[in-house]
């Protein structure tokens, strides 16, 4: 007789989740020599221990602490790139600008990127059928709590000038309810972070507006300034050109500047 299983509103755990996490861990240590001390089996055990046998609407940041400890990594000052609602471009950028890092360029972010997972209370099974949806079911689910935990840590350890890529095509360019707006902004440490520089990415080719004047950007500036961190903003009018110029900075068409309106 199949046992009763809670039906959640979100999609279930990603197929082959344990194998994917282990394989990604090995791949990451291959490419990042400074992380070769990492024991991928222990990483998986810590990951699993955070959500297996636990009610998936009652996950805490504490549950992820063993995993966070195993994945401890530091980013050099001035090299942290945060992003909100524009993940693909942020990742394309750090793939070219190899000395800058998004959360997904770090071990823990790399392991979990684009994956879903959850377990069930009192069983050792992974739930491949459904997992809690943040809006429809609960916010304290394994995936949401994971990203909140690692995003908090990523922001806390940032230093120097921190950059953030924002999507200028959204109605709220800065969204207080995003991970960036609700977690990362509030966990930048003023004693370590001198400034936050926002890059507002324009969507339309003919869009010449200064989106650094957007009310939500002004709201971000206010929050950051109150935390004694300086704020700068740049418009990236042509993201395709921006990436091209990161790849080939000597290109003559790049010398004229691809972003304008530098705000203090």
């Amino acid at each position: 007789v199949p046992r009763w299983r809670q039906q959640w509103s979100g999609s279930g755990t990603t197929s082959r989740f344990p194998e994917t996490v282990l394989a990604r861990c090995v791949k990451y240590t291959e490419v990042h020599p400074e992380m070769r001390h990492v024991d991928c089996q222990s990483v998986w055990d810590a990951f699993k221990g955070a959500f297996i046998s636990k009610y998936p609407c009652n996950i805490t940041e504490e549950d992820y602490q063993p995993l966070v400890k195993l994945g401890t990594q530091t980013v050099p000052c001035n090299k942290t790139l945060l992003w909100s609602r524009i993940k693909d471009l942020a990742h394309q950028f750090t793939q070219v600008q190899r000395d800058m890092f998004t959360l997904e360029d770090m071990l823990l972010g790399y392991l979990a990127d684009d994956l879903t997972w959850c377990g069930e209370f009192n069983t050792f099974e992974i739930n491949y059928q459904s997992c809690p949806d943040w809006r429809k079911d609960c916010s304290n689910n394994p995936v949401s709590v994971f990203w909140k935990t690692v995003s908090r840590r990523f922001a806390e350890t940032a230093c120097g000038v921190v950059h953030v890529m924002l999507n200028g095509s959204r109605s709220k360019i800065f969204d207080k309810n995003s991970t960036f707006g609700s977690v990362e902004v509030h966990n930048l440490q003023p004693e370590k972070v001198q400034a936050l520089e926002a890059w507002v990415i324009h969507g339309g080719r003919e869009d010449s507006r200064d989106l650094c004047q957007d009310p939500t950007i002004k709201e971000l500036e206010s929050i950051i300034s109150k935390r004694n961190i300086r704020f700068f903003c740049k418009n990236i009018y042509r993201p395709d050109k921006f990436l091209q110029c990161v790849k080939n900075p000597e290109d003559s068409s790049c010398l004229s500047g691809i972003h304008h309106h530098h705000h203090h």
Partner: antibody, heavy 121, light 107 residues
Framework: QVTLKESGPTLVKPTQTLTLTCTFS??????????VGWIRQPPGKALEWLAH???????RYNPALKSRLTITKDTSKNQVVLTMTNMDPVDTATYYC?????????????WGQGTLVTVSS | DIQMTQSPSSLSASVGDRVTITCQAS??????VAWYQQKPGKAPKLLIY???YRYTGVPSRFSGSGSGTDFTFTISSLQPEDIATYYC?????????FGQGTKLEIK
């Protein structure tokens, strides 16, 4: 089947430099994810990790001995060489080489038989 | 450096006995602990890694458990061929460190 074998002098004088070679088969250091390390064991005592080298020439040393150690590899000969300078009688030990594999971090799963090195004048 | 304190340093047991060896790390190593068996005049052999995973071909009577700082190695039913010295090792961080060993003898 993976096999490793250590070779080198059985006797060295104090202040001299020790050179040990680990020759292996069934293992290639041109293969991503593989590495070889050195561990020693003084007579009747515990094991002490010395150094490791990975397929891509990434090296790790025991900080307490780092200034005296050099690890290198010759991929074409399937060999890893450890040199240890300024030998002292306290360095008398059986020296082992062993394989490591990415993902299990620094767990040694295959070991050589060991070679006893005595430091004496 | 992380110190690995093994106990007991020696123990005597009878064939068929359940044998337990403990290892304490001086700081949290999560589950990054391995156990090796070394017979006189031979190289160590890997038995357990990542605290509880039996290495390929290792008999099921050998097991490991623990996390954080406290780890246990167990032989569920001692066999004559198990007479050896057993070492724990943390593989959490460099420098890799070993316990001082537990010498196991038959009564």
């Amino acid at each position: 089947q993976v096999t490793l074998k250590e070779s080198g002098p059985t006797l060295v004088k104090p202040t001299q430099t020790l050179t040990l070679t680990c020759t292996f088969s069934g293992l290639s250091l041109s293969t991503s994810g593989k590495g070889v390390g050195w561990i020693r064991q003084p007579p009747g005592k515990a094991l002490e990790w010395l150094a490791h080298i990975w397929w891509d020439d990434d090296k790790r040393y025991n900080p307490a001995l780092k200034s005296r150690l050099t690890i290198t590899k010759d991929t074409s000969k399937n060999q890893v060489v450890l040199t240890m300078t300024n030998m002292d009688p306290v360095d008398t030990a059986t020296y082992y080489c062993a394989r490591i594999e990415l993902g299990r971090s620094y767990v040694m799963d295959y070991w050589g038989q060991g070679t006893l090195v005595t430091v004496s004048s | 450096d992380i110190q690995m304190t093994q106990s007991p340093s020696s123990l005597s047991a009878s064939v068929g006995d359940r044998v337990t060896i403990t290892c304490q790390a001086s700081q949290d190593v999560i589950t990054s602990v391995a156990w090796y068996q070394q017979k006189p005049g031979k190289a160590p052999k890997l038995l357990i890694y990542s605290a509880s995973y039996r290495y390929t071909g290792v008999p099921s009577r050998f097991s490991g458990s623990g996390s954080g700082t406290d780890f246990t190695f167990t032989i569920s039913s001692l066999q004559p061929e198990d007479i050896a010295t057993y070492y724990c090792q943390q593989h959490y961080t460099i420098p890799l460190t070993f316990g001082q060993g537990t010498k196991l003898e038959i009564k």
